[in-house]
């Protein structure tokens, strides 16, 4: 069948999800495309526990996540509700800063060197994390 019962090679399993950590950079949209081509999505952080797991693997490096406000409100790429969900912004972030001189504000979220989140110019070539959930069907206990 098409169910994903275990993580692909070079992906890391954690709490019924699979994670892939890039070692090169891409703009946010290109990173998003990359994850989709892996039948995955940019990482969606839903808990402090998941935040710590991702932070441990990426180290002190700017890294894209699946959160953006390119169309107005902040949205997670998998539809997870932003308003009621987990957040870990740096103080005074997001600030949609226009002072970078690159045109426009800051519409894409990334992990900073201390793991807390910042909004930044989506064209910056940061590393990224892909995530895909193991299929619910595979989580059911086997029939005896």
């Amino acid at each position: 069948g098409s169910e994903r019962t275990c993580c692909p090679v070079n992906w890391v399993e954690h709490e019924r999800s699979c994670y892939w950590f890039s070692r090169s950079g891409k703009a946010w949209a290109d990173a998003d495309n990359y994850c989709r081509l892996e039948d995955a999505h940019l990482v969606v952080v839903t808990s402090w526990e998941e935040q710590k797991f991702v932070q441990h693997h990426i180290g002190p490096v700017n890294t894209w996540m699946g959160l953006h406000d390119q169309n107005g409100p902040w949205k997670w790429v998998d539809g997870t509700d932003y308003e009621t969900g987990f957040k870990n912004w740096r103080p005074e972030q997001p600030d949609d800063w226009y002072g970078h001189g690159l045109g426009g504000g800051e519409d894409c979220a990334h992990f900073t060197d201390d793991g807390r989140w910042n909004d930044d110019v989506c064209q910056r070539p940061y590393r990224w994390v892909c995530e895909t959930e193991l299929d619910k069907a595979s989580q059911e206990p086997p029939l005896l």
Epitope: K26, A27, N33, D39
Partner: antibody, heavy 118, light 107 residues
């Protein structure tokens, strides 16, 4: 042995349709994104389309968008390219290729020739 | 779209010569670059990925370098089977694009 084998090429009139197939063997087909790349006679390589391993995501070159459709049948280990509204400039050898995590193509088929002419 | 250029477009060399082919991207692509060899009437063959990583089974006389916009493929000592056309490909963003190719032929 890892292998890709294209078929389905031929002569077709402008405005016509053709479906190319690519039979894969020797690797876990549904674990890899697959692509089509073409080469017009005496010209360079042009990327056409790519599809994710489970078929949920596709991307196309602007030159074929809306006319070509990439698909796959993982139960048959086969990749397809449905080509509609064909034009003379679509004349080329069409290769299927296996994508790597670095977005390069490490395995290529032998190619199938598509000629669009009246 | 990202445009890829290659130079030279062709080069005539002798067996044993060192050959250097350059590839330039119209914008920064980090190390998202691959090199291919294509012999007449054959499918392309992957030589280098991620700008400098040698594909399994490819002879060590092939090497790649560069990052950002400027990249180089080097063949340290050309062998008879290396006479072919070489293409670079950017893998940074869709649509993936190839350089126009560099033909390496016998002097």
């Amino acid at each position: 042995e890892v292998q890709l084998l294209e078929s389905g090429g031929g002569l077709v009139q402008p405005g016509g349709s053709l479906r190319l197939s690519c039979a894969a063997s020797g690797f876990t087909f549904n674990s890899y994104a697959m692509s089509w790349v073409r080469q017009a006679p005496g010209k360079g390589l042009e990327w056409v389309s790519v599809i994710s391993g489970r078929g949920g995501t596709t991307y196309y070159a602007d030159s074929v968008k809306g006319r070509f459709t990439i698909s796959r049948d993982n139960s048959k280990n086969t990749l397809y390219l449905q080509m509609n509204s064909l034009r003379a400039e679509d004349t080329a050898v069409y290769y299927c290729a296996k994508r790597t995590p670095s977005d390069a193509f490490d395995i290529w088929g032998q190619g199938t020739m598509v000629t669009v002419s009246s | 779209d990202i445009q890829m250029t290659q130079s030279p477009s062709s080069v005539s060399v002798s067996v044993g010569d060192r050959v250097t082919i350059t590839c330039r991207a119209s914008q920064d692509i980090s190390d998202w670059l691959a090199w291919y060899q294509q012999r007449p009437g054959k499918a392309p063959k992957l030589l280098i990925y991620a700008a400098s990583s040698l594909e399994s089974g490819v002879p060590s006389r092939f090497s790649g370098s560069g990052s950002g916009t400027d990249f180089t493929l080097t063949i340290s000592s050309l062998q008879p089977e290396d006479f072919a056309t070489y293409y670079c490909q950017q893998a940074n963003s869709f649509p993936f694009t190839f350089g126009p190719g560099t033909k390496v032929d016998i002097k």
